[in-house]
């Protein structure tokens, strides 16, 4: 059963992780990029299922993909290069799903703009905060 | 509701410069758009040629990238083509168009009516 | 330079279902967008991001993607559906845009 010191380290981390991603949609949000709509036309692919940490799976296969849409972003309303922002994100969704877990990730027929992706992945870390707290 | 209407001559002689202007009514040029020039050649299909962003930053298609040149100016609400350098080939009907806001799909929402552009001496 | 490949022609009975295709190395990830041409007209959108109906579109009209295919699909073809047909897509990155080169459709 997991231990009070373990869920509240798994609150910060999902709190960290719902940081960054807001971080990134404020990002690109900035209606001052030309950029954003050429972003729009990059297709993310969407978990079928993201209830559980083990469905971060789903999100971190499309990291690599984010990255390269961040990189042709040529913000600079990032604080870390799109590269190091990637990898933080990376180790906090490794640590929350677990690195030994072996779940095959499910994605919908419908893919997404960055941006529902974004949205959709940060609604995920809001909801598994709630049931935390 | 955008609008859009091109204007400039309709014959331009070989080797000389082809020059069209869109007119942006209904909305401002300086939203979160990029503004589009496309041609279509008699009986031929749809071929984009560049864009600009109110900021003046541009993309071009690589094919014609040497020869165009496409400028904004926002004080008039409109934006511009020059094509240098025009054969025959050139001879088409070019259409201005246009994407809606950020936030809604990309693409063109908004088309001109298009101006047919004769390329002959 | 980048290309999206689409059949010239496509002919159907009306009431029947067409089904146009287009082709490109970047729709994995790269959104498709369809224009409707009628003679003498200006194109007008009727599909954006792969799937989804702008609005005034007619439900018969629809899009899926798959791997590097996008497929423009019109249920019950009417003859007002007589038109150009072109997919619309951008590179992988980003900054270049390009349409297929068209398909013409043919309600007999």
């Known amino acids: 059963a997991p231990t009070s010191s373990s869920t509240k380290k798994t609150q910060l981390q999902l709190e960290h992780l719902l940081l960054d991603l807001q971080m990134i949609l404020n990002g690109i949000n900035n209606y001052k990029n030309p950029k954003l709509t050429r972003m729009l036309t990059f297709k993310f692919y969407m978990p079928k299922k993201a209830t559980e940490l083990k469905h971060l799976q789903c999100l971190e296969e499309e990291l690599k993909p984010l990255e390269e849409v961040l990189n042709l972003a040529q913000s600079k309303n990032f604080h870390l290069r799109p590269r190091d922002l990637i990898s933080n994100i990376n180790v906090i969704v490794l640590e929350l799903k677990g690195s030994e877990t072996t779940f095959m990730c499910e994605y919908a027929d419908e893919t997404a703009t960055i941006v529902e992706f974004l949205n959709r992945w940060i609604t995920f870390c809001q909801s598994i905060i709630s049931t935390l707290t | 509701q955008v609008q859009l209407q091109e204007s400039g001559p309709g014959l331009v002689k070989p080797s000389g410069t082809l020059s069209l202007t869109c007119a942006v009514s209904?909305?401002?040029?300086?939203?979160?758009?990029?503004w589009s020039w496309v041609r279509q050649p008699p009986g031929k299909g749809l071929e984009w040629i560049g864009e600009?962003?109110?900021?003046?930053?541009?993309n071009y298609n690589p094919s014609l990238k040497s020869r165009v040149t496409i400028s904004v100016d926002k004080s008039k609400n409109q934006f511009s083509l020059k094509l240098s350098s025009v054969t025959a080939a050139d001879t088409a009907v070019y259409y201005c168009?246009?994407?809606?806001?950020?936030?809604?799909?990309?693409?063109?929402?908004?088309w001109g009516r298009g101006t047919l552009v004769t390329v002959s001496s | 330079s980048y290309e999206l490949t689409q059949p010239p022609s496509v002919s159907v009975s009306p009431g029947q279902t067409a089904r146009i295709t287009c082709s490109g190395d970047?729709?994995?990830?790269?959104?498709a967008y369809w224009y409707q041409q009628k003679s003498g007209q200006a194109p007008v959108m009727v599909i954006y991001?792969?799937?989804k109906r702008p609005p005034g579109i007619p439900e018969r009209f629809s899009g899926s993607s798959s791997g590097t295919m996008a497929t423009l699909t019109i249920t019950g073809a009417q003859v007002e559906d007589e038109a150009d047909y072109y997919c619309?897509?951008?590179?992988?990155?980003?900054?270049?845009?390009?349409f297929g080169g068209g398909t013409k459709l043919t309600v007999l």
């Open positions: 168009a246009s994407g809606t806001e950020v936030g809604a799909p990309h693409g063109f929402d908004y």
């Open positions: 209904g909305g401002s040029i300086s939203s979160s758009n990029w």
């Open positions: 600009i962003y109110h900021s003046g930053s541009t």
């Open positions: 970047a729709l994995p990830r790269k959104f």
């Open positions: 991001e792969d799937s």
């Open positions: 619309y897509s951008t590179d992988s990155g980003g900054d270049v845009s390009v």
